[in-house]
Amino acid sequence: GELETSDVVTVVLGQDAKLPCFYRGDSGEQVGQVAWARVDAGEGAQELALLHSKYGLHVSPAYEGRVEQPPPPRNPLDGSVLLRNAVQADEGEYECRVSTFPAGSFQARLRLRVLVPPLPSLNPGPALEEGQGLTLAASCTAEGSPAPSVTWDTEVKGTTSSRSFKHSRSAAVTSEFHLVPSRSMNGQPLTCVVSHPGLLQDQRITHILHVSFLAEASVRGLEDQNLWHIGREGAMLKCLSEGQPPPSYNWTRLDGPLPSGVRVDGDTLGFPPLTTEHSGIYVCHVSNEFSSRDSQVTVDVLDPQEDSGKQVDLVSAS
């Protein structure tokens, strides 16, 4: 006869491990007992359980409540046992010794591998600002046994670096994603992908990139100079910019206070019917937590009675 077992039994943390040991005997042969022991190199054998043809199952005190026989029906030549709720410390070498009649004793070894699935965590780097050099966008850490694989899934251009820390029964892997921040990255997903044999599918954690920036400011509304004449209604100036975080707008007049009747509505400056007192230099001040920008325009309200043409100067400052 001969023993049938597995070289390696792989189980996920918390699951039950079936340790197989089947005696393939000739007709008339009987199994008297099957003794299971843990036999890690450098340590003495630690008894696990005994399956005895007459006495039944004995579980050694160290494994009390954790070892069972597989559910019926059972073959008397089957010495397999179930190790309940596998923990990392169970990982190692196991031996089954089968005493048969009349063929004598047989033994076989197997290795129990306990997979510890990772619980990944993603940590964003420092605040990203346009104009910075290569900057840490995020780091992703996953610890498991065996060591997990940590990669990144993103459309954003960047570089990755990984490092690994080995512990007694597991390994922690940290991967960092670096990039040169630009406004085009704003709102883009950066996904950490963790692969591990103990996972049914990859684990993914997504971080949305936020890059602080503030675009140059410009003012619209003076494109057609001839429209800015006395009596015109609905004249307005609109300040154009964009940023992250979204900027706030403030309007001032360089050469005095805003004329009465002029309405400030965020990025828009609305005028009542134009008069010559609306002529002047107007400044749009755009700001967010990252930066601030100014843009100024000169408004010259024309009197249609006058022949001279309207002059408009546009000046942008930051």
């Epitope: 008297g32 007992q33 003794a35 005895h52 006495y55 039944g56 050694s60 005493s99 004793s105």
Partner: antibody, heavy 126, light 107 residues
Framework: EVQLVESGGGLVQPGGSLRLSCAAS????????MSWVRQAPGKGLEWVSS????????HYADSVKGRFTISRDNSKNTLYLQMNSLRAEDTAVYYC???????????????????WGQGTLVTVSS | DIQMTQSPSSLSASVGDRVTITCRAS??????LAWYQQKPGKAPKLLIY???SLQSGVPSRFSGSGSGTDFTLTISSLQPEDFATYYC?????????FGQGTKVEIK
């Protein structure tokens, strides 16, 4: 025929020592675990100690741990029990017994005692 | 330690009677149980091992049953030589422990 013959019992004062012997014959002594079991007058049976065939492993009852030592001399087919610091409650008939050898290579369980000696009386009294 | 509780502690019976003695373990012991017979002034004698296996040379009127925590020794037809004290013993764990004994007396 399997035979187990104890000797060495007698009267001893509290705190004293005694060494019991058990001469075995009729079986391959080294193949068997051997045990000592005692029985106080008018009382039930109490396991005292066991020792494996190659003398590498032994077990003791809590009540005798640190005071009694089990040993064997396989060349003489003899089992011993060295009893020190004896107390009145150690008074009993001491039996030497052979374990039924139908469990092999597994020390976490004991097996039934299939052969017993006739016993030797130990009396601890002042 | 595993406690073994026998009942009854004594019983009176006549020759030819069917006698049943029970033994309960304080925790599961599979079939790691033996029964012994002891007569006054004599050493115990193994009757049953593995809860139900008859030791060689023991009359077939003795039988054992049970597994886990509850066990029974039955003498199907009591004979004069069967009047003695009977002990159960678990050998599942160290220390092996005995029941307190059941004395079978002549009615």
């Amino acid at each position: 025929e399997v035979q187990l013959v104890e000797s060495g019992g007698g009267l001893v004062q509290p705190g004293g020592s005694l060494r019991l012997s058990c001469a075995a014959s009729g079986f391959n002594f080294t193949d068997y675990w051997m045990s000592w079991v005692r029985q106080a007058p008018g009382k039930g049976l109490e396991w005292v100690s066991s020792i494996i065939g190659d003398d590498s492993t032994n077990h003791y009852a809590d009540s005798v741990k640190g005071r009694f030592t089990i040993s064997r001399d396989n060349s003489k087919n003899t089992l011993y029990l060295q009893m020190n610091s004896l107390r009145a409650e150690d008074t009993a008939v001491y039996y030497c017994a052979r374990e039924y050898s139908d469990v092999v290579d597994y020390v976490s369980v004991r097996t039934p005692l299939d052969y017993w000696g006739q016993g030797t009386l130990v009396t601890v009294s002042s | 330690d595993i406690q073994m509780t026998q009942s009854p502690s004594s019983l009176s019976a006549s020759v030819g009677d069917r006698v049943t003695i029970t033994c309960r373990a304080s925790q599961g012991i599979s079939s790691y149980l033996a029964w012994y017979q002891q007569k006054p002034g004599k050493a115990p004698k193994l009757l049953i091992y593995a809860a139900s296996s008859l030791q060689s040379g023991v009359p077939s009127r003795f039988s054992g049953s049970g597994s886990g925590t509850d066990f029974t020794l039955t003498i199907s037809s009591l004979q004069p030589e069967d009047f003695a004290t009977y002990y159960c013993q678990q050998h599942y764990t160290t220390p092996p422990t005995f029941g307190q004994g059941t004395k079978v007396e002549i009615k």
